[in-house]
């Protein structure tokens, strides 16, 4: 999902946190979409 950044050591060291953040934001987006859907 971030091919070029993988050459940076930082990407490797933060990978777990990045994945956590992505999962969280996907959850938040899904919840937001649900709220929007429910209000229609």
């Amino acid at each position: 999902d971030n091919p070029s950044l993988s050459i940076d050591l930082t990407f490797h060291l933060l990978r777990t946190l990045l994945e956590l953040a992505r999962t969280q934001s996907q959850r938040e987006r899904a919840e937001q979409n649900r709220i929007i859907f429910d209000s229609v």
């Epitope: 950044l5 050459i7 050591l9 990407f11 060291l13 933060l14 990045l18």
Partner: antibody, heavy 118, light 112 residues
């Protein structure tokens, strides 16, 4: 060659905000995270946070969370660090830095002195 | 946070003689990938820091071979085999294995 050129020195009043810029050249800006480190006069180095210029992911040192905002402008290959609610203890030289595939802070900007004084 | 403690605070040296700086971490800084992300930086007066050593013992490009790093777990050392005038300044150890990333307090290498 990799170059990180920072904005000039600033003098601010307590309570104000400051925005420091860091213009990158000599490499593909979106290939490397940008970090910010500060150094109070005569003191050691303190990591403030890191931003992914590609996706915008940001990780702040908890110590600065809520007061620091890191952003990038991909069109100009420039990273920004804004610190709000300034106090005298924020008087420091602020550095941007970039890593490599092997180390976290391989290239550094020249530093920006921010003086907070009433 | 991982506290990085450097000793001595100041190291008075004679040019041409060796110097040694110690860095101790408050907990193991072996990353979950089995690497130890311990780096050493040199800062000359009025300049930004400069990377010397990464992953405990690897010299960064352009760093003279009189600089060497060693150690494991929580105890690390930076050695300068023969100090030259251009080596004077402050040296910092740094750990990147645990967030927040932390630096040691610095060791000033100065002329005796």
């Amino acid at each position: 060659q990799v170059q990180l050129v920072q904005s000039g020195a600033e003098v601010k009043k307590p309570g104000a905000s400051v925005k420091v810029s860091c213009k990158a050249s000599g490499y593909t800006f979106t290939d490397y995270f940008m970090k910010w480190v500060r150094q109070a006069p005569g003191q050691g180095l303190e990591w403030m946070g890191v931003i992914n210029p590609n996706q915008g992911d940001i990780f702040y040192n908890q110590k600065f969370k809520g007061r620091v905002t890191m952003t990038v402008d991909k069109s100009t290959s420039t990273a920004y660090m804004e610190l709000s609610s300034l106090r005298s203890e924020d008087t420091a030289v602020y550095y941007c830095a970039r890593g490599t595939d092997r180390a976290l802070f391989a290239y550094w900007g020249q530093g920006t002195l921010v003086t907070v004084s009433s | 946070d991982v506290v990085m403690t450097q000793t001595p605070l100041s190291s008075p040296v004679t040019l041409g003689q060796p110097a040694s700086i110690s860095c101790r971490s408050g907990q193991s800084i072996v990353h979950s990938d089995a690497n130890t992300y311990l780096e050493w930086y040199q800062q000359r007066p009025g300049q930004p820091p400069r990377l010397l050593i990464y992953k405990v013992s690897n010299r960064f490009s352009g760093v003279p071979d009189r600089f060497s790093g060693s150690g494991a777990g929580t105890d690390f050392t930076l050695k300068i085999s023969r100090v030259e005038a251009e080596d004077l300044g402050v040296y910092y150890c740094f750990q990147g294995s645990h967030i927040p990333w932390t630096f040691g307090g610095g060791t000033k290498v100065e002329i005796k």
